[in-house]
Interface confidence: low
């Protein structure tokens, strides 16, 4: 039977009754064209959405945007598009909304053709009031707050100016022209490329790279024949060309581009790639484009500089500069990712990796499905993910895989059941331990989000007809209530909950369609009355993450340590609340050679857990490049994986000797960087 | 237009085996998959299986795994059906379907080929 | 696999009747339905598809409805050219399946 349909799943008490004193409908008075929605700071409950309609007229396009202000989480809005001016808003800019709890939000107004600049709008409460300012530039990107002053503002302008707010966008200054990106780094520092002949298309790989620390006062060119670059976790990476041909290599900076090393990696050609897929302040991951338009690549992940890299995947999807890649990190559980590679005979495979990279597996089988007939043998396939490729090929995939940090565990995602991925209509499936294992939750492709921490799960089915029920699950999706939550059924468009999942309302988008005309319209259903009670210490019980074997010694350890959570017991009907914290109990492991990734020179054979040394490199000196500087390697092979703490046990032997001579590799040695003042 | 057409009628001995080809043309063949469906004589359609003409790869129904093989040459546009050890419940009309474009839910035909009789008898 | 049960396997109506179709599936298949028109010693001929949308080229008196596991056909007023056997088929999972096929003849 269908999940939620057999006998165990008892019904949720009086919850129709519950949920219609808490469905809170509104019908905007708008006619429909496109929305928007925004929530501004954490816990606030405060919501902006933006309407906006295009009537496109012979000469030109009339637009039309309407303003509406939620502080009840979406239950009740008012008109506030008296406080822009009623000022039709550029939705390409979005509303861009400040870090953390600042209240601050920017919208960038649509301006008539001759005008010397744009126009912004600005407010620093929460959007309750707004301050219109004209601007000395037309900006070509959304205003990019700085993440540790939110009163910092940049933005680039249609004429590749880099221009900069100190005052929240009251005042602005041209700091640099010839701007091609600009990005903030930590402490305020600002990291951009500049061309110097033509534009930035003309002058690609023949870029410079700069960086200020003081908004503009002073410069330093930290990189020259910079192709792109790109900022995560704590490393700086920039692609440079090589002096002698087109082909372009990784340099890698954890100060800023003060110094850089050459990433141990291959070097691709005009038409290949490099991508950061995933990066802490640990290591990163890393993909790099196979030669020639095959649609895939290698994932590496590097040691704790960026700078050795041990290869991780073969054959992983990515399909061109900027496309398509399932690569998702799974943030319920420390140490987990789900991607696609592309097999030999061109089907899709889904791989997860549970431990940062070091291994790939396929996800195991759910227990209540069978294989498809993808499969050749109908006992033995696997779980296959839907994710962005899926839906950017217009599958029947609504949604991407969701996990959220504070519903431990809990995974999420359309796929379906065999030796690839089918493109036959996929089902939900859920997992509860982080993709160990899992279990088919919902027929048929459905909208899905997280709320309480995991407490509630709820979903809609995807359907092109007008919907009016919304599903319900408070076991991580074992059984399902449905509610009908309006007698006129919508065409629904998106569920839109707080990020952050720890919210009890869900917001239901769509619009109503008469004869004439079309209205947005939103149903916000609260929770809190179905989870009568908080939670307490009874309703939680032990699980031990990564278990696979209980009865060994070192089950659960990943990256050098074992973490034991406190997790809602399925069977309870109770809210975790907002201020719910995730509990968890850390212990240390024994190092194993497992903790080690091989150092550079080295490479681990298939299904060996021993690093041996590269042929080629055998009986040589491991010379390499390290912030400009030769390194004399003395190593029996191993380093230790970024992040991982395990100690004692196995303890392999590292020593690095500077060797004072300058590498010629390295093309962003220190002689080649300059700076200048303001 | 899109047209499918199919090699012409055969005769088989049990055990033997046939092979019916397929030439798609108003469209890009390795676009779409190629499906095969049959049908024996006044009964029911029943479906084969079909090929990616992109990749090569196939998907064969249960049934006839093992006995079917499916095919195609994108220099000419043509896809084969090919069915080992016949037995006379295998006389059947053959069809060639196009089906929905690559990663699409679209497994409904829109394109049939004329068909191809085929006839298994000692 | 999803087994699709069509009913009735026969059916004799006049011109001008309205004609209508069913096709069961052992399994909720939501939309994912085609409905074809076979006419003998021809190939099939697509009506219908995801349980309600028509075929261009189709005349409009052909209509799909359904979703789940109970789908109809219905002939709004049945011509001439329309006796004919009628195939629904599920594509929600492999192996593809086809109903057994409903004969429309002249009464």
């Known amino acids: 039977s269908a999940p939620g349909e057999d006998e165990e799943c008892g019904r949720v008490r009086d919850f129709v009754a519950k949920l219609a004193n808490n469905t809170h409908q509104h019908v905007f008075d708008d006619l429909r064209g496109s929305v928007s929605l925004s929530w501004v700071g954490d816990s606030t409950g405060v919501i902006l959405v933006l309407t906006t309609f295009h009537v496109p007229l012979v000469i030109m396009t009339f637009g039309q945007s309407k303003l509406y202000r939620s502080e009840d989480y979406g239950k009740n809005f008012k008109d506030i598009t008296d406080l822009i001016n009623n000022t039709f808003i550029r939705t390409e800019f979005g509303m861009a909304i400040g870090p953390e709890n600042s209240g601050k939000v920017v919208l960038t107004a649509e301006v008539s053709g001759g005008s010397r600049g744009g126009r912004i709008f600005r407010s620093s409460d929460f959007a309750k009031n707004f301050v219109q300012t004209d601007l000395p530039f037309h900006p070509l990107t959304q205003m990019m707050y700085s993440p540790q002053n939110s009163d910092y503002l940049l933005a680039l302008s249609t004429e590749n100016g880099l221009w900069v707010s100190k005052n929240f966008g009251g005042k602005w200054e041209e700091i640099h022209k010839a701007v091609c990106l600009a990005k903030w780094g930590s402490d305020n520092t600002i990291f951009f490329t500049t061309y110097a002949n033509g534009s930035c298309k003309a002058d690609l790989g023949a870029l410079e790279l700069w960086r200020t620390s003081d908004l503009g006062k002073s410069f330093k060119t930290i990189g020259v024949k910079i192709y792109s670059f790109g900022l995560g976790g704590r490393f700086l990476f920039a692609s440079v060309m090589a002096d002698k041909d087109t082909t372009r290599r990784i340099h890698v900076s954890t100060d800023q581009g003060d110094t850089w090393s050459m990433a141990q990696l291959p070097s691709v050609g005009q038409e290949q790639f490099y991508s950061i897929l995933a990066a802490n302040d640990d290591m990163v991951f890393m993909h790099v484009d196979e030669p020639g338009d095959t649609g895939f690549g290698t994932i590496f992940t590097s040691d704790d500089r960026g700078i050795v890299y041990s290869k991780s995947l073969d054959r992983h999807l990515y399909t061109t500069t900027g496309g398509e890649t399932d690569f998702t990190n799974v943030t319920s559980l420390r140490g987990v990712y789900i991607t696609s590679v592309l097999s030999e005979d061109n089907s899709i495979q889904t791989m997860i990796t549970f431990d940062q990279g070091g291994r790939w597996t396929h996800l195991r089988k759910p227990e209540n499905s069978e294989c498809d007939a993808t499969a050749k043998n109908k006992n033995e396939c696997s779980l296959h993910i839907h994710a962005s490729y899926s839906i950017s090929q217009k599958l029947n995939v609504p949604m991407a895989p969701l996990s959220e940090p504070n519903a431990v565990g809990i995974v999420i995602a359309h796929g379906s059941v065999g030796d690839a991925i089918s493109v036959m209509v996929p089902d939900v499936y859920i997992s509860d331990d982080g993709g160990y294992s899992w279990t088919k939750m919902l027929e048929g492709p459905h909208y899905y989000t997280i709320l309480d921490s995991g407490g509630i799960i709820v979903a809609i089915e995807h359907s092109s007809r007008p919907i009016n029920v919304i599903k319900f699950s408070t076991d991580e999706g074992q059984c399902w209530q449905t509610y009908t939550f309006t007698r006129d059924p919508i065409y629904f468009t998106g569920l839109a909950s707080e990020p952050g999942a720890r919210s009890m309302n869900i917001s239901i988008w769509g619009f109503t369609e008469s004869f004439l005309t079309s209205q947005w319209v939103s149903y916000t259903i609260d929770f809190k009355d179905i989870l009568e009670r908080n939670c307490e210490e009874k309703d939680y019980t032990i699980w031990l993450a990564h278990s696979t074997d209980p009865e060994d010694y070192e089950d659960g350890c990943i990256l050098g340590y074992k973490e034991q959570f406190l997790r809602l017991r399925k069977s309870s009907v109770c809210q975790n609340g907002r201020d719910y914290v995730v509990t968890k109990q850390p212990s240390i492991c024994l190092c194993s050679l497992e903790d080690f990734l091989c150092d550079f020179g080295y490479y681990r054979p298939e299904n060996d857990s021993k690093c041996v040394e590269q042929p080629e490199l055998k009986g040589h000196d491991l010379e390499f490049c390290l912030y400009g500087r030769e390194e004399h390697l003395t190593t029996n092979g191993y380093r230790k994986i970024p992040g991982d703490k395990c100690q004692g046990g196995v303890n392999p032997v590292r020593e690095v000797k500077d060797l004072k001579k300058k590498c010629t590799s390295n093309f962003l040695s220190p002689e080649k960087q300059n700076s200048k003042s303001n | 237009q899109v047209q499918l057409v199919q090699s012409g009628a055969e005769v088989k001995k049990p055990g033997a085996s046939v092979k019916v080809s397929c030439k798609a043309s108003?469209?890009?063949?390795?676009?779409?998959?190629m499906h095969w469906v049959r049908q024996a004589p006044g009964q029911g359609l029943e479906w084969m299986g079909w090929?990616?003409?992109?990749?090569?790869?196939?998907n064969y129904a249960q049934k006839f795994q093992g006995r079917v093989t499916m095919t195609r040459d994108t220099s000419i546009s043509t896809a084969y059906m090919e069915l080992s050890r016949l037995r006379s419940d295998d006389t059947a009309v053959y069809y060639c379907?196009?089906?929905?474009?690559?990663?699409?839910?679209?497994?409904?035909?829109?394109?049939w080929g004329q068909g191809t009789l085929v006839t298994v008898s000692s | 696999d999803i087994q699709m049960t069509q009913s009735p396997s026969t059916l004799s109506a006049s011109v001008g009747d309205r004609v209508t179709i069913t096709c069961r599936a052992s399994?909720?298949?939501?939309?994912?339905l085609a409905w074809y028109q076979q006419k003998p010693g021809k190939a099939p001929k697509l009506l219908i598809y995801?349980?309600?949308s028509l075929e261009s080229g189709v005349p409009s008196r052909f209509s799909g409805s359904g979703s789940g596991t109970e789908f109809t056909l219905t002939i709004s007023s049945l011509q001439p050219d329309d006796f004919a056997t009628y195939y629904c088929?599920?594509?929600?999972?492999?192996?593809?399946?086809f109903g057994g096929g409903t004969k429309v003849e002249i009464k």
């Open positions: 108003g469209y890009t063949f390795t676009g779409y998959y």
């Open positions: 088929q599920q594509y929600k999972s492999y192996p593809i399946t």
């Open positions: 090929i990616n003409p992109n990749s090569g790869g196939t």
């Open positions: 995801k349980a309600s």
């Open positions: 379907a196009r089906g929905g474009p690559q990663l699409r839910v679209a497994e409904y035909f829109q394109h």
């Open positions: 399994q909720s298949i939501s939309s994912w």
